[in-house]
Amino acid sequence: GSERTCCPVNWVEHERSCYWFSRSGKAWADADNYCRLEDAHLVVVTSWEEQKFVQHHIGPVNTWMGLHDQNGPWKWVDGTDYETGFKNWRPEQPDDWYGHGLGGGEDCAHFTDDGRWNDDVCQRPYRWVCETELDKASQEPPLL
């Protein structure tokens, strides 16, 4: 495949990445699948600067990101190391709260009103952000 050099229509370019901001809500798995079908992934926040950029675009809205601990440890969907990477949890989060009555704990991370992160039940229909890197090879065949 060829290297993507500019962002698709309706995506926002920032620091060699393209971002797409949903305006409806989906469960985390559906949001994750949506991004994959767009040859992208749920947003992976690697710096305070990227956090501020995403926060500015989503506003004060609960929004899924590409971070989960459904298989045990917290993991970013693109393989970025969680332990050594950027974190921005709300105080006392993540807490894997079981008191919601929906079954299980809280295994998916989202941006809250003020941008800080919370873990929540993955099935809640929150908005989401997709991200794809400009320098990565796209799945489309090269133009002849």
Epitope: A27, N62, R90, H100, G101, D113, D114, R116
Partner: antibody, heavy 124, light 112 residues
């Protein structure tokens, strides 16, 4: 404007079944969870059941679990409540309710639109 | 289940006078996302409930500013600064932080 219209209520004997329906219009039905809430005569409100926007999850009050089934058809913008093994204590007005409050740019997990309700009377 | 307790259960108010309804929950309604999932509804006679206040203190669109909500954690209050004839009905508080979603018993407000 957003509208929810319930139907299917009536008088039924204990142990029998009834199916309530709710026709939705004026909003993107497939984007919202939907509830059934009931109100017995002269009493307060009791949450009955909820179904997720895509039908993937369903939850019930303990008082109706195993007897009632909530379902939806997003292609027809309809919500149903199948009520089996009805009891006298199920007598109530049943409301179809939209989940989520659309305020500016966000969705909140309250209930912002209620239908007018349909009356179910379980009596021998 | 979270128990919601409203007081008083009935209230008779002179038009133009203030009114206050209390709602207490058996558990905190503060979620990890920083929001508090407490709502107030008014059910006018012969009608379905209508949303007044969401998340403790936010007035829903079209709701007059004489209605205000306050509180945190487990203690909440709905205030009507100057009661009008059209405010009569049954007031319900509701929590949605935990399934099953639960309502208070309702407070009946009437005009003297």
């Amino acid at each position: 404007q957003v509208q929810l219209v319930e139907s299917g209520g009536g008088v039924v004997q204990p142990g029998r079944s009834l199916r309530l329906s709710c026709a939705a219009s004026g909003f993107t039905f497939s984007s919202y969870g939907m509830h059934w809430v009931r109100q017995a005569p002269g009493k307060g409100l009791e949450w009955v059941a909820v179904i997720w926007y895509d039908g993937s999850y369903k939850y019930y009050a303990d008082s109706v679990k195993g007897r009632f089934t909530i379902s939806r058809d997003n292609s027809k913008n309809t919500l149903d409540l199948q009520m089996n093994s009805l009891r006298a204590e199920d007598t109530a007005v049943y409301y179809c309710v939209k989940m989520g409050i659309e305020v500016a740019v966000d969705y909140y997990y309250g209930m912002d639109v209620w239908g007018q309700g349909t009356t179910v009377t379980v009596s021998s | 289940d979270i128990v919601m307790t409203q007081t008083p259960l009935s209230l008779s108010v002179t038009p133009g006078q203030p009114a206050s309804i209390s709602c207490k929950s058996s558990q905190s309604l503060l979620h990890g996302d920083g929001k508090t999932y407490l709502y107030w509804y008014l059910q006018k006679p012969g009608q379905p409930p209508q949303l007044l206040i969401y998340e403790v203190s936010n007035r829903f669109s079209g709701v007059p500013d004489r209605f205000s909500g306050s509180g945190s954690g487990t203690d909440f209050t709905l205030k009507i600064s100057r009661v009008e004839a059209e405010d009569v009905g049954l007031y319900h508080c509701m929590q949605s932080i935990q399934l099953p979603w639960t309502f208070g018993q309702g407070t009946k407000v009437e005009i003297k």
